[in-house]
Amino acid sequence: SQVSQNCHNGSYEISVLMMGNSAFAEPLKNLEDAVNEGLEIVRGRLQNAGLNVTVNATFMYSDGLIHNSGDCRSSTCEGLDLLRKISNAQRMGCVLIGPSCTYSTFQMYLDTELSYPMISAGSFGLSCDYKETLTRLMSPARKLMYFLVNFWKTNDLPFKTYSWSTSYVYKNGTETEDCFWYLNALEASVSYFSHELGFKVVLRQDKEFQDILMDHNRKSNVIIMCGGPEFLYKLKGDRAVAEDIVIILVDLFNDQYFEDNVTAPDYMKNVLVLTLSPGNSLLNSSFSRNLSPTKRDFALAYLNGILLFGHMLKIFLENGENITTPKFAHAFRNLTFEGYDGPVTLDDWGDVDSTMVLLYTSVDTKKYKVLLTYDTHVNKTYPVDMSPTFTWKNSKLPNDITGRGPQ
């Protein structure tokens, strides 16, 4: 049903869903702080533009009585319950910043007539792709998939002279929300990744993964998994690994690789880490000081959500356009705005673009070094280290199938 919006006469409200079930176990207080910091910046920017308006946020809390698992498993109805609460209270703002869980976002989008924009820090799954009024400020699974296909096909770099067409995917069901949907996308038989690969098998048991490491009859040398070094070590332990195995460790929202004095443990030598390029000032900013390295991106997405709203509000007000229109609801895409830590670009479907970074462990220095970067906006790979000090033979990535010659 249509809900009246508190979004006119110089007063503009943002509805922030504070859900018990969240993509990351971040205290709601930290998210509130991020939103409030964003509001301060937006007010300053609007004032500088000569726009004398009020912008506030209303935090809508779930009662947590029914949906209390804390993770995303019971989030499907929580989002709808919160929307109902907003509807009953007639407290809808100009924009909804909220559900981070794919289940809740998908259900809310499906079950409501959204005439307002929805901004999500999360909603990683393919089921949230191509939604007309949804904006996602953390890299969704589709972006990861496009990188992997691009990298698999690459065969003209000094360190990668073979195209790959095979892969194992390790997915045991205990993943974090982001990893769950990333691996889900790789597993899906109808996905772009599956379509482009000739062979792909999902390993669901620890033993399956462990056996592949030294199995002479393995069908691929490449294993994709998602998590941090600790997660890999828990699984792999001190087991020997065949020399032509390549583990791709997807760990997008972890800035630790770029911190001072970090050294890679021995077990990371066969591993390429895929992560996001860290923000210029974020590692030392006051905003992120109290956040763990894996939570910075989540709180930052909330903050950037506020800044995105401020950006759109400014444009529409300067053009004398109405905020409570489908045009406004559909406008949060195909643009670049000034985020907390520099420009943020959204693609045609409202999904954030970013620079992904592939790291390797230098056998000389035991440091993580950048092998290449990938711009999700243009779907292009840029080599960085042309002569990496790899563990692999001849300092080149091996073929994905043992014993197969040049392609």
């Epitope: 070590y233 332990g237 630790q256 004095n261």
Partner: nanobody, 115 residues
Framework: EVRLVESGGGLVQPGGSLRLSCAVS????????VDWYHQAPGKQRELVAG???????SYADAVKGRFTISTDNVKDTVYLQMNSLTPEDTAVYYC?????????WGQGTQVTVSS
């Protein structure tokens, strides 16, 4: 941050034994590895023995059969039992840990083997 405190060093006669302790400020199974290194005067620091939370132990050739690395999971302490000591074992012994991200070092404990 991982803090390491070594103890148990001292003066011992050739053929004698000592047990060094390294108290770790974190649960030892939450970190990757704990090692013992030694540094003799005017020489480089060398790995003596290592333990990983995956359950592996390793030893330098010179100490195999004489030194044993072990852990107390309750006290989060790693021990180095040193038997059949020789004057060549005289050195400062350092505890080292890697928590999957960074290297940490203790202050060291002096071991002197002399008659």
């Amino acid at each position: 941050e991982v803090r390491l405190v070594e103890s148990g060093g001292g003066l011992v006669q050739p053929g004698g034994s000592l047990r060094l302790s390294c108290a770790v400020s974190k649960n030892i199974f939450s970190i990757y590895r704990v090692d013992w290194y030694h540094q003799a005067p005017g020489k480089q620091r060398e790995l003596v023995a290592g333990w990983t939370s995956g359950g592996s132990t390793s030893y330098a050739d010179a100490v195999k059969g004489r030194f044993t690395i072990s852990t107390d999971n309750v006290k989060d302490t790693v021990y180095l039992q040193m038997n059949s000591l020789t004057p060549e074992d005289t050195a400062v012994y350092y505890c080292h840990a890697h928590d999957h991200w960074r290297d940490y070092w203790g202050q060291g404990t002096q071991v002197t083997v002399s008659s």
